[in-house]
Amino acid sequence: SETTTGTSSNSSQSTSNSGLAPNPTNATTK
């Protein structure tokens, strides 16, 4: 699951994982 950047109830920032694929596979060899 991807989280979005924002402020949670304990005032900690939520790291945005949205720059990375959720279930990545290896790049196809060409």
Partner: antibody
Framework: EVQFVESGGGLVQPGGSLKLSCAAS????????MDWVRQASGKGLEWVAE??????????YYAESVKGRFTISRDDSKSTVYLQMNSLKTEDTAIYYC??????WGQGTLVTVSS | DIVMTQTPLSLSVTIGQPASISCKSS???????????LNWLLQKPGQSPKRLIY???KLDPGIPDRFSGSGSETDFTLKISRVEAEDVGIYYC?????????FGGGTKVEIK
């Protein structure tokens, strides 16, 4: 304020080991996918390893160049991610950054592998 | 591995003028969920990198709107509408669609 603070770098001989730590604060660490990225002096960025969160079964991924030698782990109770580096080579010499999925970055810790 | 190729290698820009950096990937970055995991990062002199943009065009919090990202599949562009002195550094594109994550070689932006 979000802070990632790396430690554990230093000078080590080829074949030796080091364990890097990255302590996070100001961030919901348990939700973060944590990565290590390195940068040799005057060079570009190279991804090293990643560990995902509990909902993703703490799955780990590694660059081919470190697979079998480096191990990434995390302790959510301490908001800390680790990189155990074994069988170090001279080409592993670099500044090692920890980053929350490329979002927040630490200041880096220098690892020098030399005899 | 997906190879990320950035051009130009360096860029000298007058303050207030626009700047553009190109990033091309050796394979499509379009992921099966319809999203494209292309990021832009800036490493200012003596500092650690900082992400500016994720998923091609989404600005990270606190990033000025003079920065914009565009592109699809294999061709991407970072644009700065009006360069400011604080924008100097090395800009990297990075793909997060297929393992291993890979970075472009960087584009050094300096003030003319």
């Amino acid at each position: 304020e979000v802070q990632f603070v790396e430690s554990g770098g230093g000078l080590v001989q080829p074949g030796g080991s080091l364990k890097l730590s990255c302590a996070a604060s100001g961030v919901t660490f348990s939700e973060a996918w944590m990565d290590w990225v390195r940068q040799a002096s005057g060079k570009g960025l190279e991804w090293v390893a990643e560990i995902r969160d509990k909902p993703n079964s703490y799955v780990t991924y590694y660059a081919e160049s470190v697979k079998g030698r480096f191990t990434i782990s995390r302790d959510d109770s301490k908001s800390t991610v680790y990189l155990q580096m074994n069988s170090l080579k001279t080409e592993d010499t670099a500044i090692y950054y920890c980053t929350g999925a490329m979002d927040y970055w630490g200041q880096g810790t220098l690892v020098t592998v030399s005899s | 591995d997906i190879v990320m190729t950035q051009t130009p290698l360096s860029l000298s820009v007058t303050i207030g003028q626009p700047a553009s950096i190109s990033c091309k990937s050796s394979q499509s970055l379009l992921y099966s969920n319809g999203k494209t995991y292309l990021n832009w990062l800036l490493q200012k002199p003596g500092q650690s990198p900082k992400r500016l943009i994720y998923q091609v065009s989404k600005l990270d919090p606190g990033i000025p709107d003079r920065f914009s990202g565009s592109g699809s599949e294999t061709d991407f562009t970072l644009k700065i509408s009006r360069v400011e002195a604080e924008d100097v550094g090395i800009y990297y594109c990075m793909q997060g669609s297929s393992l291993p994550w890979t970075f472009g070689g960087g584009t050094k932006v300096e003030i003319k």
